[in-house]
Structures are given as C-alpha cells and as structure tokens.
C-alpha cells in the first residue's frame, strides 16, 4: 500500500483580525495508526495548537468529524485570529507507541494576518509658537499587519511634503507600528487651521484613518499696539485708547502706565474675535490735563499668554490745557475701561 | 456542557481490589483521552494514568503500573480505573479528568483493616 | 520521568500584595504542555492557565503565566481574597505526566 501523506493544499492563507483562520489538512491513508496534532513552526520551539485527544484548545475546532475513526480530514478553524497568531502551520501524523513517534509533517501553511492600524494619534509641540517659526507634529499608528501602509500630511487640505515616516520593527514581526513626523510653517492666520495625518492601508478597504492637530493649540499670534488720543470729551479731559490687535490666545494682561507708575491693570474679558480667529480688545483712560503741570507720558502695556511684555507710549501735552483751579481729587468709574486721573 | 460523574466512596481492606466508574456527559469519550489522578489526604496530585477509549490503548505511571487498569466502555461513555493490591498508603482521593481540562468530583477510597 | 518542583511550599501574603509562584522542571519541558491548576479544599482541581500563559475561561486578568525551557512561574498582580488556594503545575510533555508538590497560599 503506498504510504501516507499529509497533504496541506494552501500554501498561504491571509485572515483580517477578528475572523476565523481555517487551515486545511487531509492524509491519504489510515495507516499507521496515531493522532494527528498541529504545531505552529518547526523543530524543537515548535508550538502545539491542537492535539486531537488531549489538552485545552478553546479557540480551535475540527472542520469534519476528525474523531471518526476513517476520517482523513483534519482541517481546523481557528477563532478570533489576532496578529500575534500568523506563522507557519504544521498538520503532523504521529504513530502511536511508547512514545508516540511523529511520522510525517504536512508542507505547512503559513498564515498572514491583516490587522488595521489604529487610529492615528497626532501631537503637537509642547509650547506654542510663533508666526513664521517652524514646529514638528508627530503622528503614531499602531498595531497593523502587514508591513506596507501609506501616510499622509495635510495642512488644511493641502498635502505637506517635509516629513519623515518610519515604520518599525524593520524586520518580521507580527505587528507593525509607523511614527511620522511633520515640519509645518505657522503663518498669523492658523489660528483656524488644522493638520491631518492620513493613513492608508490594505485593511481599510480605501478609506483611510485620519489623525488631526488643531493649530489653535500649538500658535501664539502676539497683539500690534496702537495708542491714540481721541478728541477732547469735555473740558480738560482727554481720552486715550489703547488698541490690541490681531492676538491669540484670549489670556492677555494690560497695564497703564502714567510716567512710569502703575494707573491700572485689567485682564481683557470682552473681546472681539476676528475672522481669522484672533481677538482684538480695546481699553481707554480719561485724562484730566488740568491735574498735571507737564507733559504726560502714558504707557499702554500688554503681557500676552505669559510672554514678556510688550509697550507703546503716548506723549501727552498738558501746556496748551489751562488748569482748572481746586479740583486735586481722584475720581475713577469702577466696572469699566475708564479712568479719571486729576 | 461537559460532565464527569464519579462514583462515590469505598472503604476497603489491605489487599483488596477497587473499581472506580467516570461517567461522561456533554461529548464522547472516544474523542479525548482520559485520564486518572490521585490525591492522597493533605498532599498533591499524583499522575496514575490515561486511556485512549478509541482503542484502550493505556499508559500508566511506573509507581502504578502492575497494580492498575485502566479501561473504557464506549457504549455507556464511561471510564473506569482498578486499583489492586491495595495497601493504606493508597487511601485518596481518585480523579477522573478528560484531556486534562475538565475534571471529576472525586472518588474518596479508604483502605483499612 | 520530568520531576517538577514548586517554590515556595507556602506563600504568605496579605490581599492586595503580589504573589509570585515558581515551578522548575528537572528537563526542558515545551511551554505548550506547562499547565497549571488552583485547588480548594474539597474540591477538584481547577484548570487555571494552559500552554504557560493563556487564562483558561473567566479566570480573571490578575493571573499571568510565563516560562520556558525549564523555568515556569504564575503572577499575580493584586491578590484577591478568592485566590487563596493550593496551585499546582503539571507537565504533558512526557510520560510519565507529573505534577508539582503545589505551592499553597495562605493569608498573612
């Protein structure tokens, strides 16, 4: 009679994550008698993953009745296949005795598992920066199988081409992770834009995974000055303004300074947002020129975001005001942006 | 789902020889190995041996071989281990277990005079 | 026949403490037949982990397993008091099959 074979028709078998691997394997004869038992890899480290009458296989099932005794299909279906199960599959035939003696091994099928990556997860630098200065976005998928995979930079929908993208580990492995990262320009009006990270992969079926950073967490669009003496409200009384313009974030700190010393400090609350998304916000004093024998420099400075503060002046002739006799008494309008100085 | 019912106590004496039946629910014991442990009163499991019912083909530990026999009936899906010669020191608990998974309640032998 | 040895004989710990259980094989044993299994009194052994690292079904997650070759050990991360017990390893991957003498842990 001519001797058994094990024969393992497919050479490779590629299952998404999640599903079910069958694996194929059928003898050609009954004789000798022994089990038949699966192994993933050869030789001495090889791993058992089914054993016919003993030992705990929950995720593994016959395809046909295996235990009938003139079956010669020892197919088996594998559940919820994860990367971490791809290799090589051998179906062996064993013959029986003290002990059990392996006969012949199949050719061995080799199992690839396609496992998407994660969502892409992108990051920013860690301080914000200014317009016209370069930062790095980093993006970080995870966990896909196999190797090739395709990604992406855009800023606001337009594709970026400094960057650099590794995928690791180089060589086999069972999963694979990508790490790209991006070089990006900000401009004054990225307050509304965004990155995005696009990834690409066989398992996504053409619709790729995306990652975005919004650019309204990594810029810092520091405020223009503008200091005007308006017309005279009343007499002796000048107001000054102090324009904040075109600044982002919101958290900005203005100080007025009459020659030198502290008049006022506020926090800017009510402002207004521009459509590129900075603020601009606006404070003023009422000066009584009456109360002053000189000349007045008055002070407009801002601390923005933390950053050292920035100033602009106003030189405020008083020579040409005549004094308004007994009026030696402070005044100021709580609540707003006003201030009364005699 | 899967059950292995044995049978309950003995009290023997010295010499004497004792049948213990496991008896299968839930699959066919000619699809798995069987196979018997002993436990003896405040100690570990000890391996005696384990049948193949498909054939009764049985390997048994050197420490019980000659004094144990292990045997299966298909028909009534049991399995059954023998235990001859019995001395005090084999006074335990006797398992059954399939394929190593799923396992008896315990049969309790006593062996004394 | 592989002679397998537990360290230590009995583990005193409190719940909430990490618990580590050894078990040496006297030959290599393949991490595929290292089983282990929790006992209580008056019950039937329970299988606990299988192939060296896999949680047998609802065996919770503070369980682990590793080893190879000669060396196999169960963790466990935060002992509950549910897992004071006697564990047992045992070997497949030769005949004779055998068991380690069990390590038993107690509460502290």
């Known amino acids: 009679e001519e001797e058994l074979q094990v024969i393992q028709p497919d050479k490779s078998v590629s299952v998404a994550a999640g599903e079910s691997a069958i694996l194929h394997c059928t003898v050609t004869s009954l004789i000798p008698v022994g089990p038949i038992q699966w192994f993933r890899g050869a030789g001495p480290a090889r791993e058992l993953i089914y054993n016919q009458k003993e030992g705990h296989f929950p995720r593994v099932t016959t395809v046909s009745e295996s235990t009938k005794r003139e079956n010669m299909d020892f197919s088996i279906s594998i559940s919820n296949i994860t990367p971490a199960d791809a290799g090589t599959y051998y179906c062996v035939k064993f013959r029986k005795g003290s002990p059990d003696t392996e006969f012949k091994s199949g050719a061995g099928t080799e199992l690839s598992v396609r496992a998407k990556p994660s969502a892409p997860v992108v990051s920013g630098p860690a301080a914000r920066a200014t317009p016209q200065h370069t930062v790095s976005f980093t993006c970080e998928s995870h966990g896909f199988s196999p190797r090739d995979i395709t990604l992406k930079w855009f800023k606001n929908g337009n594709e970026l081409s400094d960057f650099q993208t590794n995928v690791d580990p180089v060589g086999e492995s069972v999963s694979y992770s990508i790490h790209s990262t991006a070089k990006v320009v900000l401009t004054r009006e990225d307050v509304h834009s965004q990155v995005i990270c696009e990834v690409a992969h066989v398992t996504l079926q053409g619709d790729p995974l995306r990652g975005t950073a919004n650019l309204s967490e990594t810029i810092r669009v520091p405020p223009t000055l503008e200091v005007t003496q308006q017309p005279v409200r009343a007499e002796n009384q000048v107001n000054v303004t102090c324009q904040v313009r075109k600044f982002y974030p919101q958290r900005l700190q203005l100080t007025w300074l009459e020659n030198g010393n502290v008049s006022r400090t506020e926090t800017a609350s009510t402002v207004t947002e521009n459509k590129d998304g900075t603020y601009n916000w606006m404070s003023w004093l009422l000066v009584n020129v009456s109360a002053h024998r000189d000349d007045v420099k008055l002070t407009c400075q801002v601390e923005h975001d933390g950053q050292p503060a920035v100033s602009k002046s106003h030189d405020l002739k008083v020579s040409a005001h005549p004094k308004e006799q007994g009026s030696n008494t402070a005044a100021e309008n709580t609540g707003s942006n006003e201030r009364n100085i005699y | 789902e899967v059950q292995l019912v044995q049978s309950g106590a003995e009290v023997k004496k010295p010499g004497a020889t004792v049948k213990i039946s496991c008896k299968a629910s839930?699959?066919?014991?000619?699809?798995?190995?069987m196979h018997w442990v002993q436990q003896a009163p405040g100690k570990g499991l000890e391996w005696i041996g384990r049948i193949d019912p498909e054939d009764a083909e049985t390997k048994y530990a050197p420490k019980f071989q000659g004094r144990v026999t292990i045997t299966a009936d298909t028909s009534t899906n049991t399995a059954y281990m023998e235990l001859s010669s019995l001395r005090s020191e084999d006074t335990a608990v006797y398992y059954c277990?399939?394929?190593?998974?799923?396992w008896g309640q315990g049969t309790l032998v006593t062996v004394s005079s | 026949e592989i002679v397998l040895t537990q360290s230590p004989a009995t583990l005193s710990l409190s719940p909430g403490e990490r618990a580590t259980l050894s078990c040496s094989a006297s030959s290599s044993v393949s991490s595929s037949y290292l089983y282990w299994y929790q006992q209580k009194p008056g019950q039937a052994p329970k299988l606990w982990i299988y192939s060296t690292s896999n949680l047998a079904s609802g065996i919770p997650a503070r369980f682990s397993g590793s080893g190879s070759g000669t060396d196999y050990t169960l963790t466990i991360s935060s002992l509950e008091p549910e897992d004071f017990a006697v564990y047992y390893c045992?070997?497949?991957?030769?005949?004779?099959?055998?068991f380690g003498q069990g390590t038993k842990l107690e509460i502290k």
């Open positions: 277990d399939r394929g190593l998974a799923y």
């Open positions: 045992h070997q497949w991957s030769s005949y004779p099959y055998t």
């Open positions: 839930g699959f066919n014991i000619k699809d798995y190995y």
